[in-house]
Each structure stands twice: as C-alpha cells, then as structure tokens.
C-alpha cells in the first residue's frame, strides 16, 4: 500500500550523491527503514531498544545512512542516469504498536548538473 | 505542552449525524505526532475506542461501528474530525479525541453527547 | 478481538493501604499495555504504558507489572486523590480495547 508521495523534500543533491530522506514522527521509538528503487530494497536501517533502554541499530542492506530523531537518510553516491527512478521508504513501526507500515516515495529525477564526473 | 479539545453539538436527534472536531495543539501530526484517536464512555460504563487517524492518513475503526464511522483530518488547521452517522439514544456518551503514542498520552475534556428526539 | 477484564471492579480501600488490581487479557499482548486513572466528570489521564513504564508526572507510589496475558496495577500507599476508576488497555492489535475498569472506594 502506497501511502502517497512524499509531502516534504525528500532528495537532496550535493557533490555528485543524493541523500533520501526518509521521515518518520519522533515518538516512534522502535522501527525498520528501508529504502527501496522501483521494488528492489537498496538499503535499511533497524532501530530497536533492549533491555536499559540501550539502541541497537542494525542494517542487513548497508548504505551510507545517518539517523536522527525523526529521519533516516540514505546517501547515494557517483550519480548516473541509471539512478533515475521511483524511490520509496518503506517504514515499518514496532513501538509503539499496533505494527504499522507505511510507504511513501518520490520520483528522483537525474539532471546533468547533478551528475558526478560532468566533462567540461 | 499538549492540549486537545472536542467540540460539536451537544444534542442531536435519532437517525442524525454527528460531527465532532478535536482541535489540538502542542504537536504536528506527522512530525512528532503519530495520530489521533476518538474514544467514548456512555454515561456510568466503561471506555469504549472508536477510530484513529495517523499522520499519514491511514484510518483504523472499532469493527462493531465501521459503517457508522468515518475519521478524517486536517493537518493544516492541527483539527481531526470524527463523524458518525445514524445516531441513536445509545449513543448518548461524552466522547474524548486522545493523543495517540503507547496508549492514549493526552486526552480532551470531553464533550458529552446526548442523543434524543 | 482482545478482551480485557479487570477485576476487582469496585474494592473499598483507606488511606495508606496498598492495593492491587489486575488486567487479564484473552490472548498475548506482550507488554504493550496501558493503565488510565479516571475521576469523576473529568477526562481519563495516563498512569502506565508499556505494562510497567510510569508516564511523565506520575507518582511512584503507582506501579504496573506483567507480560502476556496477566498484569497488575499496584498502588503502594494510597492518597486520599487516588480514590477514582482505574481503567487498563491493551494496544498490541487492533481493535484497541479497554477493561470494564475498577472503582477503588474510601472505605
């Protein structure tokens, strides 16, 4: 289920990369991230709390990724025109529960300006 | 600091509908708020959960009132609205509109509801 | 759905007393359980989530225990702002679903 386009900036060029940005509300406490082109999973990110309180965070697919409060950003790097596509962050909520997904994404448009090895 | 409160009618007739507003303040539905649910207590009984909306607009309803049952929200105005259709003398309640986290954190005051023609 | 039942639903208790209720649910909810404190004419307020996490404010006289089927709510010595309807919820699955609730009473 396709929750809907993503309702903020979700790529963000800089040197030849893209970071995703993937939102989540700052309460969830427990959850999976994964960053998925057309339905392929590229990329994930679990965070989960044992006992203490103490947050382990895990990724089976890994990426350059940074977590914060309330996001999760995926970095791609040495952009090519293969990159262009639907990309959507499939996040899946633990805690609080019920166990909830929700799927949101946008279409990453590739443009020669934000190439990484443009020829002069 | 968190604040939610109902508002709507107070009395409505049999077989009417009801709209009732919960206007909240002190979170932003998707930012750091994971949504709103509606729960009632007729007069004397027990707590009775009806619906939630989540910040991305996914809607879960109590199964025994469903058809009855449709929760929307405005993200813009920080308002989610519950209205419920075909109204009987059973459903006289006060009706609270509740901060959703691990349970219910925040709740409105409250608005009682009486159903009669 | 989950059915919650409390019980005691009404026990009559004095000021410093320990009291004890108890929230049985029909089928596992792990620890994801909610214990509601409810005075009259007023709005529900959050004691406990997490079967045993105290909310922000709460007393520590206020205490929840319990996995799976069988939880508690222990009151270690009642105040005299306690006596009120204590009502617990499970929110492991949908539909969310309340207990009956329990009316602890001045004796």
């Known amino acids: 289920e396709i929750n809907g386009s993503a309702n903020y900036e979700m790529f963000i060029f800089h040197n030849g990369g893209v970071q995703i940005l993937c939102k989540y509300p700052d309460i969830v406490q427990q959850f999976k991230m994964q960053l998925l082109k057309g339905g392929q999973i590229l990329c994930d990110l679990t965070k989960t709390k044992g006992s203490g309180n103490t947050v382990s965070i895990k990724s089976l697919k890994f990426c350059h990724s940074q977590l914060s409060n309330n996001s999760v950003s995926f970095f791609l790097y040495n952009l090519d025109h293969s990159h262009a596509n639907y990309y959507f962050c499939n996040l899946s909520i633990f805690d609080p529960p019920p166990f909830k997904v929700t799927l949101t994404g946008g279409y990453l448009h590739i443009y020669e300006s934000q190439l990484c090895c443009q020829l002069k | 600091q968190i604040t939610l409160k109902e508002s709507g009618p107070t009395l409505v007739k049999p077989t009417q509908t009801l709209t009732l507003t919960c206007t909240f303040s002190g979170f932003s539905l998707g930012s750091n708020g994971l949504g709103v649910g509606w729960i009632r207590q007729p007069p004397g009984k027990a707590l009775e959960w009806l619906a939630l909306i989540y910040w991305d607009d996914d809607k879960r309803y109590s199964p025994s009132l469903k058809s009855r049952l449709t929760i929307t929200k405005d993200s813009s105005k920080n308002q989610v609205v519950l209205t419920m259709t075909n109204m009987d003398p059973v459903d006289t309640a006060t009706y609270y509109c509740?901060?959703?986290?691990?349970?219910?954190?925040?709740w409105g005051q409250g608005i009682l509801v009486t159903v009669s023609s | 759905d989950i059915q919650m039942t409390q019980s005691p639903s009404s026990l009559s208790a004095s000021v410093g007393d320990r009291v004890t209720i108890t929230c049985r649910a029909s089928q596992g909810i792990s620890s994801w359980l909610a214990w509601y404190q409810q005075k009259p004419e007023k709005a529900p307020k959050s004691l406990i989530y997490?079967?045993?996490s105290l909310q922000s404010g709460v007393p520590s006289r206020f205490s929840g225990s319990g996995s799976g089927t069988d939880f508690t709510l222990t009151i270690s010595s009642l105040q005299p702002e306690d006596f009120a309807t204590y009502y617990c919820?499970?929110?492991?699955?949908?539909?969310?679903?309340f207990g009956g609730g329990t009316k602890v009473e001045i004796k």
């Open positions: 997490a079967a045993s």
């Open positions: 919820q499970q929110y492991n699955s949908y539909p969310l679903t």
């Open positions: 509740a901060h959703r986290n691990s349970g219910f954190d925040y």
